[in-house]
């Protein structure tokens, strides 16, 4: 293109992109009609006064990933049409006052991933049209009152990955149009009452990875439009009874990685839109009746890696839409036969890594759609007659790492397993633990002549007499067993506007390698 600086490329006459280490100053002359200018990965260290004076039609300016550490106050003079400005990924420590003066059209300002140590009210006082402000990944230790008071149209504010230790309750009070507020990965220990009261249009609040210990009871009471609330990886030890009472739009709530010891009935809700609840990696010891009963649309409930030893029979009341229930890596020894009775739509349950000694015969009685059951690494010696018989969709059952007692009482279970071998997977098969002479042998193919007759009174219903060698013609064709529906890996909290981290922690879900993809 005629007019395109020699060290730049122009994919269109009005769109200039200048990249490369050989560039040490803003290229000149720039085309007078330039609408976008990108200066990326250069060795520019400073912006002088008015380097863009002759390109007043500029709409978008990206100066990213440079060595930029110093900007003169008048660097952006005469850019009254500028709507998008990014100074991200540079080495800025200080912003001159008045830098953004005259940028009357500015809508998006990206200052992320610099080394800014402070911002002042005067920095943004001229930016009345600003809708998005990204300040994440800097070294901010505090936000002064009034810093955002003039940004009444702001809809997104990202302050994540800074060094904030406290927030003034007045700092967000004028941001009535704010929809997204991100404060993740700071050093916040508490949030003063009233901090979010002015944010009546807030849809997402990201507070994960701080050091928050206590939540004020009415902290979210004015945020009726909140849809996503991230509180994970903090130090929260208890939830005030009314903390979530006025969040009818909430559809995602993360509380994993805290210090919660108990959940009181009614703590969640009413939240008719909540689809997922993440509570793994806490210190929960028991689940009382009706603790989740307001969550009528919940589909995913993750309670793994806690210390749950008791689940009340009505703990899961109301969860008629639940698809996934993760209870693995807890301290469960016994389960009431009715505990899962209300979970008519449950598809996947993980109970591995507990201390379950036995299961009631009716434990899965009403859960006809179960597709995967994880029971490995418990204390199971046998299972009740017919416990899985009605589960026509069951395609994955994990039973290994249990101390199976291979006396004659085990034969019905063995025969069922023989018929349903494809459902057990190929990774690890259940093996006998006792008697000693068959220890380590596969439960499915134990030698009949070695097995010892039962001499104890069984704790489970007695089985009808079953042949040692079932008719092999009734083996299901392994190709017809549908593989389990792949569980979605849990999506971690947002870390910034451009990245979502996906946890690869299969132990949270209790997934096998094959399932997790």
């Amino acid at each position: 293109y005629y007019g395109c600086p020699s060290e730049c490329t122009c994919s269109r006459a009005s769109q200039v992109e200048c990249t490369g280490a050989r560039i040490v100053a803003v290229p000149t002359p720039l085309p007078w009609n330039a609408m976008s200018l990108q200066i990326l990965n250069t060795h520019i260290t400073e912006l002088s006064e008015s380097p863009f004076l002759n390109i007043s039609a500029l709409i978008a300016l990206r100066i990213e990933k440079n060595e930029l550490s110093h900007i003169m106050p008048g660097a952006f003079r005469n850019l009254g049409s500028l709507r998008y400005l990014s100074l991200a990924n540079n080495k800025l420590q200080v912003l001159p006052i008045g830098l953004f003066q005259g940028l009357d059209s500015l809508e998006s300002l990206l200052l992320s991933s610099n080394q800014l140590v402070q911002i002042q009210p005067a920095h943004f006082s001229q930016c009345s049209n600003l809708k998005e402000l990204q300040l994440h990944g800097n070294h901010l230790e505090y936000i002064p009152d009034g810093a955002f008071d003039h940004l009444v149209g702001l809809t997104k504010l990202n302050l994540g990955k800074n060094s904030l230790t406290h927030i003034s309750p007045r700092v967000f009070q004028h941001l009535g149009n704010l929809q997204v507020l991100r404060l993740y990965e700071n050093r916040l220990t508490d949030i003063p009452m009233g901090t979010f009261d002015g944010l009546v249009n807030l849809q997402e609040l990201a507070l994960q990875q701080n050091q928050i210990g206590l939540l004020s009871p009415g902290l979210f009471h004015n945020n009726h439009n909140l849809q996503r609330l991230y509180l994970s990886n903090n130090h929260i030890s208890q939830l005030p009874p009314s903390i979530f009472m006025q969040l009818p739009q909430l559809n995602r709530l993360t509380l994993f990685g805290n210090s919660l010891k108990e959940l009181s009935p009614g703590i969640f809700g009413p939240m008719p839109n909540l689809r997922e609840l993440w509570l793994y990696d806490n210190h929960i010891t028991s689940l009382p009746d009706n603790v989740f009963s307001n969550l009528r649309q919940l589909q995913v409930l993750i309670l793994s890696r806690n210390q749950i030893s008791f689940i009340s029979p009505g703990a899961f009341n109301g969860l008629t839409e639940l698809r996934e229930l993760s209870l693995h890596t807890n301290a469960l020894q016994d389960l009431d036969g009715n505990v899962f009775r209300m979970l008519a739509n449950l598809q996947n349950i993980s109970l591995q890594n507990n201390r379950l000694r036995q299961l009631p015969g009716n434990i899965f009685a009403n859960v006809n759609g179960l597709m995967t059951i994880q029971l490995q690494n418990n204390q199971l010696e046998n299972l009740p007659l017919g416990i899985f018989d009605h589960l026509g969709k069951l395609c994955e059952l994990r039973l290994y790492d249990n101390p199976w007692r291979c006396d004659s009482d085990i034969l019905p279970l063995r025969n069922w397993l023989l018929l349903n071998q494809p459902r057990l997977g190929t990774d690890t098969v259940p093996v006998c633990f006792s008697p000693a002479n068959v220890r380590g042998q596969s439960l499915i193919i134990i030698n009949v002549n070695v097995a010892v007759p039962s001499v104890h009174v069984p704790e489970v219903p007695s089985y009808p007499e079953t042949s040692w060698y079932p008719d092999t013609s009734s083996y299901p064709d392994t190709t017809s067993i549908s593989s389990t529906t792949e569980l979605t890996s849990p999506v971690e909290d947002y870390t910034d506007l451009t990245t979502i981290q996906v946890t690869d922690d299969r132990s949270v879900w209790g997934m096998t390698q094959a399932q997790s993809g």
């Epitope: 769109q15 609408m35 709409i59 990206r62 998006s108």
Partner: antibody
């Protein structure tokens, strides 16, 4: 090669909302404008608005202001167009389109289109 | 943001040349050299044929050319071929940083 793949056809009731997705592959997603253009049956093309994903804020045609919301998820390279308060005249094929520069003054790449039918 | 004005239809015989006009205002066509032309076959997505008034993307035949005078842009197709039969749309950048299309022209190859 840049590809834009859109979500499937939708049938909606008047007064409801529809959200159409557009997944981009084969090139940088964040630093190019994604625009949405619709075409009613037998009618011409109509620009609805656009977004530069890295900058987050969308620009809308006056006609659709307040009724359309365009968003982008950089982590999945997906843009979305949500149209609310649907009426029968919103029945159309909705296209996402992308240019070759930060600001789209023209559109080199188009999605396959998503038919949205609004009917009671 | 009124649509740019195009003739509803034009026609021509194979081998002939045709021109499609696109009239706007000083706020769009007349104010910027950012006029584009698209070809659309039935049931298909539009295809960019001309950008910035007169530039052709790679792969587009040199039988297609564009020009502009004042508030009116034009698309000329020379050596008309059967496969050129389609709808053609002009598009311009506007003063309020948005985009406006023409109403479309149906080209019939006789």
């Amino acid at each position: 090669q840049v590809q834009l793949v859109q979500s499937g056809a939708e049938v909606k009731k008047p007064g409801s909302s529809v959200k159409v997705s557009c997944k981009a592959s084969g090139g940088t997603f964040s630093s190019y404008t994604i625009s949405w253009v619709r075409q009613a049956p037998g009618q011409g093309l109509e620009w609805m608005g656009g977004i530069i994903p890295m900058f987050g804020t969308a620009n809308y045609a006056q006609k659709f202001q307040g009724r359309v919301t365009i968003t982008a998820d950089e982590s999945t390279s997906t843009a979305y167009m949500e149209l609310s308060s649907l009426r029968s005249e919103d029945t159309a094929v909705y296209y996402c389109a992308r240019g070759v520069a930060l600001l789209a003054t023209d559109f080199d790449y188009w999605g396959q289109g998503t038919l949205v039918t609004v009917s009671s | 943001q009124s649509a740019l004005t195009q003739p509803a239809s034009v026609s021509g015989s194979p081998g002939q040349s045709i021109t499609i006009s696109c009239t706007g205002t000083s706020s769009d066509v007349g104010g910027y050299n950012y006029v584009s032309w698209y070809q659309q076959h039935p049931g298909k997505a539009p295809k960019l044929m001309i950008y910035e008034v007169s530039n052709r993307p790679s792969g587009v035949s040199n039988r297609f050319s564009g020009s502009k005078s004042g508030n009116t842009a034009s698309l000329t197709i020379s050596g008309l071929q059967a496969e050129d039969e389609a709808d053609y749309y002009c598009q311009s950048w506007t003063h309020d940083n948005s985009v406006v299309f023409g109403g479309g022209t149906k080209l019939t190859v006789l």
